[in-house]
């Protein structure tokens, strides 16, 4: 039986049940290569409290559909008196990066995971030439996730004192230049994640090979190497390589530019101080507030919730968007879709789509940007579920009693973007991270 998601096969992936202090290792095409789980384990569970290992999915006992992967075992489990077998179930959804498997829940018999990934899309529009896992768990099982830094189009310019060259990078995947045919970036060879431009020539100085690594609690490392043979003539016989170290800052701050810290014989060392390198709980919340010791800030968007069935309305030329954030109030137009953002076609108001659901909410504050994300909306033709990204700006003089109003800024591949100026986005900082 052919592997259902070949892009995911090259790596052993990790997921964590934080509540129970359990680390899962997942290899969807082969075995995880952990002795304690046996030679054919595809999903190996490491209980750190009891220091025990259990195989909860066997690679030989795999069954797959386009959106679900199940690994059974021969181990019995007692579920309400019936003789079931322990199994793992991974539900796949279309995403814009390789993504990460997320632990959902576990019963006596079944360990459930969800994975939003390009590998599950109906079309190849989000697929990279080359992409590697872009997250890591530290020794305290806290997740550090650089997926939000991955650019689906374009690149980051590395700050370098050399006026004759420009070094462009992407994070964990190659640089896509198709959306900007006029720039210097266009000359970069396909597959490169680190592209050096000198004059009118562009050189591949690194492609992603291995996933993100953690070197210390707040330092993550990504390494790129030039795959193809044939040395570049300006590298003195050495093969080019790029090492990017992502550093979690010691206190809250605006984002910084990736900086070249060392360069010798085409070995480039880059340091990037960014809060995305911090553990995810420092940056994100499933509610509409971020506060307390954990996050070093106080943010509360709950006053933006609308009561009594009214919604914020944002004009999107062909569409109207109805938004009801930070609550679970049904939007009248949205046919009981549990939508936080609802898209209605102006020319045919029966065409209604959920552009993100209120149960699928993430509030993120990182590198000075405050963003509220709603995902899990109605599917587009690619298989990607519509989502909405609301970028908040602090405005102490916002109208509508300080609440302000969301403004639609555009759509990219079924992701709807809004900006929202409001006094409730004014962040209060604590200083003790």
């Amino acid at each position: 039986q052919a592997a259902p998601f070949p892009e995911l096969c090259s790596y052993t992936w990790e997921a964590v049940d934080t509540k129970n202090n359990v680390l899962y290792k997942i290899n969807i095409c082969g075995s995880v290569d952990i002795v304690q789980c046996g030679p054919s384990s595809a999903v190996c569970m490491h209980d750190l409290k009891t220091r025990t290992y259990h195989s909860v999915g066997d690679s030989v006992l795999r069954s797959a559909t386009r959106s679900l992967l199940e690994f059974n075992t021969t181990v019995s489990c007692d579920q309400q008196g019936t003789n079931h077998r322990v199994q793992s179930s991974i539900a796949f959804l279309c995403g814009k990066t390789l993504g990460t498997p997320e632990f959902v829940t576990a019963t006596e018999c079944v360990h459930y995971f969800e994975w939003r990934t390009t590998a599950a899309c109906k079309k190849d529009i989000f697929k990279a030439n080359k992409e590697v896992p872009c997250y890591v768990f530290d020794e305290e099982l806290r997740k550090h996730d650089l997926n939000p830094l991955i650019k689906l189009s374009g690149a980051y310019l590395v700050d370098d004192s050399d006026p004759d060259t420009s070094l462009f990078i992407n994070v964990c995947r190659d640089i896509d230049t198709l959306r900007d045919p006029g720039s210097q970036l266009r000359a970069c060879p396909p597959g490169t994640a680190a592209c050096l431009v000198r004059g009118h020539q562009a050189f591949d100085v690194g492609q992603p090979r291995d996933g993100l690594k953690v070197v210390r609690k707040d330092r993550l490392v990504l390494s790129y190497v030039r795959e193809e043979a044939g040395k570049l003539d300006f590298c003195d016989g050495h093969s080019p390589a790029v090492t990017i170290t992502f550093v979690c800052p010691s206190e809250r701050r605006e984002g910084t530019i990736p900086k070249l810290t060392a360069k010798s014989n085409c070995r480039y060392e880059i340091e990037w101080i960014t809060e995305y390198a911090c553990h995810r709980d420092y940056l994100e919340s499933k509610t509409c507030s971020l506060s307390g010791e954990q996050q070093d800030v106080s943010i509360d968007l709950t006053p933006l919730a609308q009561s009594g069935g009214s919604s914020y309305i944002s004009d999107g030329k062909e569409y109207l968007f109805y938004l009801n954030v930070c609550g679970e109030t049904e939007i009248q137009f949205c046919n009981k879709k549990q939508a936080a953002v609802c898209q209605v076609k102006k020319s045919d108001t029966s065409q209604v789509k959920a552009a993100g659901r209120y149960h699928n909410q993430t509030l993120r504050y990182s590198d000075g940007d405050l963003t509220l994300i709603y995902f899990g909306g109605d599917e587009c033709s690619s298989g990607f579920q519509r989502m909405s990204v609301i970028n908040f700006e602090c405005n102490k003089t916002a109208g509508n009693d300080g609440k302000g109003t969301p403004v639609f800024t555009g759509e990219v591949d079924c992701t709807y973007e809004f900006t929202w100026d409001t006094e409730y986005a004014c962040v209060h900082h604590h200083h003790h991270h």
Partner: nanobody
Framework: QVQLQESGGGLVQAGGSLRLSCEAS????????WGWFRQAPGKEREFVAA????????SYADSVKGRFTISRDNAKNTIYLQMNSLKPEDTAVYYC????????????????WGQGTQVTVSS
């Protein structure tokens, strides 16, 4: 690719103000970063100011800091350059540009350009 059209240039006395506009049409991706550049006769095109579309993070050339302000109106797909306390050395053709490169002020990293609008500051 995105199309850009500048407007708002003209002749102004030193110390005066102008507001330039740049309207973006076509598929305006939110991944773009937007910039204003200028080119005086016989000189290279130079960076003036930049803004990210999805947030209001800005950067400015030292020569215009405190005098020029870049802003955006997402609803109108338009970016602006408010120029105050204008000096004769601000005389140039001003261009609006879009880039898919983050953290750049280098004109060669901008792939989409407007036609430019002339600003002349008389003493």
């Amino acid at each position: 690719q995105v199309q850009l059209q500048e407007s708002g240039g003209g002749l102004v006395q030193a110390g005066g103000s102008l507001r330039l506009s740049c309207e973006a049409s076509g598929r305006t991706f939110n991944t773009y970063n937007w910039g204003w550049f200028r080119q005086a006769p016989g000189k290279e095109r130079e960076f003036v100011a930049a803004i990210r579309w999805s947030s209001s993070k800005t950067s400015y050339a030292d020569s215009v800091k405190g005098r020029f302000t870049i802003s955006r109106d997402n609803a109108k797909n338009t970016i602006y350059l408010q120029m105050n306390s204008l000096k004769p050395e601000d005389t140039a053709v001003y261009y609006c540009a879009a880039s898919i490169v983050d953290f750049t002020t280098n004109p060669s990293h901008f792939g989409s350009w407007g036609q430019g609008t002339q600003v002349t500051v008389s003493s």
